[in-house]
């Protein structure tokens, strides 16, 4: 049925889906607080621009009776139920902020006539790539994949003189939502990562991973996994590791590595951590005081979703353009807007760009140090530490295949 949008005559509404099944186990109250803080900022910015309009949010909760796993497994149906609720109420905002699970976003995108924009804090999977009216404000799997291929091919840095073309991927099925889709993208046989690598094997059992660490017949020295240091320790413990093993630990939404008093545990010495350049202004924010670093990124994405809407609303109002048009729905991409913590850039497909940071553990200081940064917007690597104090021989990353000479 045709749903009218509450989106004209100086009154603009944001529909926020408050789903029980979510990419991160975040109390909905915290997300509400993030949205409300964002609304205050948007109202201030619009008033500052001389635009006397009203902007509000409607929070739409599912009943939680059927879809109560809490993670993303039953999110498909929950998302569609919420859409049905909107349809029955005959009331929709100018924009839909909400689904963070890849399953729910994919299905909702398919099942709606999208003449309005959809903003997601999550939806990491490849199946949510290249959607014309979907904007994703947390780094999707495609961005990770492009970094890894770029890094694998790099062979002209003082600390990386070999191109790599092989990898193991550890994926045991217990991952968080972000990790699940990141690893899923690496595993997919049709993905860019798989296409660019000559050898790739997925390790699904703890024992498989543990055996590879000292297996003389291993096909690659590089293992990609996703999670935090504690996750790695549970798996690896204090087991001996061959000297030319490199573990790439993907831990994007965790800025604990940058805290002043953090010392890297010994088991991290042959690990490179891939994370995002840290933010710091949320620490004083009312809605984020009790959040873990990961959850801070999730709440920040909700807040930035509101600011993005405010940014687009301001542009369209100043240009005298209608908000309830396909042009507005398709406009949330290929732009930079002022987020809560500085400028946020969206690529041509509405996906957030960011600076990824590759860290290593200094054998001298036992601190995490920045090895290089990677700008997802330009797909370019920038070395930071040209003389890293690695654990690896000659302070250089080893070849990915033992015994193979330089290429």
């Amino acid at each position: 049925s045709q749903v009218s949008q509450n989106c004209h005559n100086g009154s603009y509404e944001i529909s926020v889906l408050m789903m029980g099944n979510s990419a991160f186990a975040e109390p909905l109250k915290n997300l509400e607080d993030a949205v409300n803080e964002g609304l205050e900022i948007v109202r201030g910015r619009l008033q500052n621009a001389g635009l006397n309009v009203t902007v509000n949010a409607t929070f739409m909760y599912s009943d939680g009776l059927i879809h109560n796993s809490g993670d993303c497994r039953s999110s498909t149906c929950e998302g569609l139920d919420l859409l049905r609720k909107i349809s029955n109420a005959q009331r929709m905002g100018c924009v839909l902020i909400g689904p963070s699970c890849t399953y729910s976003t994919f299905q909702m995108y398919l099942d709606t006539e999208l003449s309005y924009p959809m903003i997601s804090a999550g939806s990491f999977g490849l199946s949510c790539d290249y959607k014309e009216t979907l904007t994703r404000l947390m780094s999707p799997a495609r961005k990770l994949m492009y970094f890894l291929v770029n890094f694998w091919k790099t062979n002209d840095l003082p600390f990386k003189t070999y191109s790599w073309s092989t990898s193991y991927v550890y994926k045991n099925g217990t991952e968080t939502e972000d990790c699940f889709w990141y690893l899923n993208a690496l595993e997919a046989s049709v993905s860019y990562f798989s296409h660019e690598l000559g050898f790739k094997v997925v390790l699904r059992q703890d024992k498989e991973f543990q055996d590879i660490l000292m297996d003389h017949n291993r096909k690659s020295n590089v293992i990609i996994m996703c999670g935090g240091p504690e996750f790695l320790y549970k798996l690896k413990g204090d087991r001996a590791v061959a000297e030319d093993i490199v573990i790439i630990l993907v831990d994007l939404f965790n800025d604990q590595y940058f805290e002043d008093n953090v010392t890297a545990p010994d088991y991290m010495k042959n690990v490179l951590v891939l994370t995002l350049s840290p933010g710091n202004s949320l620490l004083n924010s009312s809605f984020s005081r009790n959040l873990s670093p990961t959850k801070r990124d999730f709440a920040l994405a909700y807040l930035n979703g509101i600011l993005l809407f405010g940014h687009m609303l301001k542009i369209f109002l100043e240009n005298g353009e209608n908000i309830t048009t396909p042009k507005f729905a398709h406009a949330f991409r290929n732009l930079t807007f002022e987020g809560y913590d500085g400028p946020v850039t969206l690529d041509d497909w509405g996906d957030v760009d960011s600076t990824m940071v590759l860290l290593y553990t200094s054998v001298d200081t036992k601190k995490y140090k920045v090895l290089l940064t990677y700008d997802t917007h330009v797909n370019k690597t920038y070395p930071v530490d040209m003389s890293p104090t690695f654990t690896w021989k000659n302070s250089k990353l080893p070849n990915d295949i033992t015994g193979r000479g330089p290429q």
Epitope: I41, G44, R45, Q47, N48, A49, G50, L51, G279, N280, S281, N284, E318, E338, D341, G342, P343
Partner: antibody
């Protein structure tokens, strides 16, 4: 109550580098862009540039090649350097805080520092 | 960059009279316009933003109007403390730019 206190050398010779620092007291440092604005004697105001707590900078293309703006969040301070100064850079230099994040209009100002360039 | 032009350069008004100051932008700034007052030896003081909204603590005799490229600052009944230089400023885009100022002096 937000206060901006600025300091730096007041007398420079041509070709030297102007260096000013602005300290922020009271209020949040992270929720704003912090600006430098100058005013030659008896003339109007010229916007030099701005920086936020993350080090994101917007600056005036007319001065860009000579301007360096930096931030030290641990001290709630930001700074301006202007290289290769000439007599045309003689002005009162103000630091300022916008009314709200990215608002672009200025509610709080430093006391101003007169910088004279003379041989 | 957007050039802001103010007129007149000097305005002579008697206390109690109304003063009308104009500001023109070289291209549209919508309503992203502010007005400031500056007295000798002091930093500028924000009066108006959003073309017509008074900043905190600014008396009601100050009012702003306009949109796009033409803007006006009106001072309803000039008090002795209102004699100063007034600047308009656009914040639609970077670089932020100011007008050259209008000096409001006692007639």
């Amino acid at each position: 109550q937000v206060q901006l206190q600025q300091w730096g050398a007041g007398l420079l010779k041509p070709s030297e580098t102007l260096s000013l620092t602005c300290a922020v007291f009271g209020g949040s440092f992270s929720g704003y862009y912090w600006s430098w604005i100058r005013q030659p004697p008896g003339k109007g105001l010229e916007w030099i540039g701005e920086i936020n707590h993350r080090g994101n900078i917007n600056d005036n293309p007319s001065l860009k090649s000579r301007v360096t703006i930096s931030v030290d969040t641990s001290k709630n301070q930001f700074a301006l350097k202007l290289s290769s100064v000439t007599a045309a850079d003689t002005a009162v230099y103000y630091c300022a805080r916008e009314r709200g994040y990215t608002y672009g209009n200025y509610e709080h100002w430093g006391q101003g520092t007169l910088v004279t360039v003379s041989s | 960059e957007i050039v802001m032009t103010q007129s007149p350069a000097t305005l002579s008004v008697s206390p109690g009279e109304r003063a009308t100051l104009s500001c023109r932008a070289s291209q549209t700034v919508n309503r992203n316009l502010a007005w400031y007052q500056q007295k000798p030896g002091q930093a500028p003081r924000l009066l108006i933003y959003g073309a017509s909204t008074r900043a905190t603590g600014i008396p009601a005799r100050f009012s702003g109007s306009g949109s796009g490229t033409e803007f006006t600052l009106t001072i309803g009944s000039l008090q002795s403390e209102d004699f100063a230089v007034y600047y308009c400023q656009q914040y639609k885009t970077w670089p932020r730019t100011f007008g050259q100022g209008t000096n409001v002096e006692i007639k």
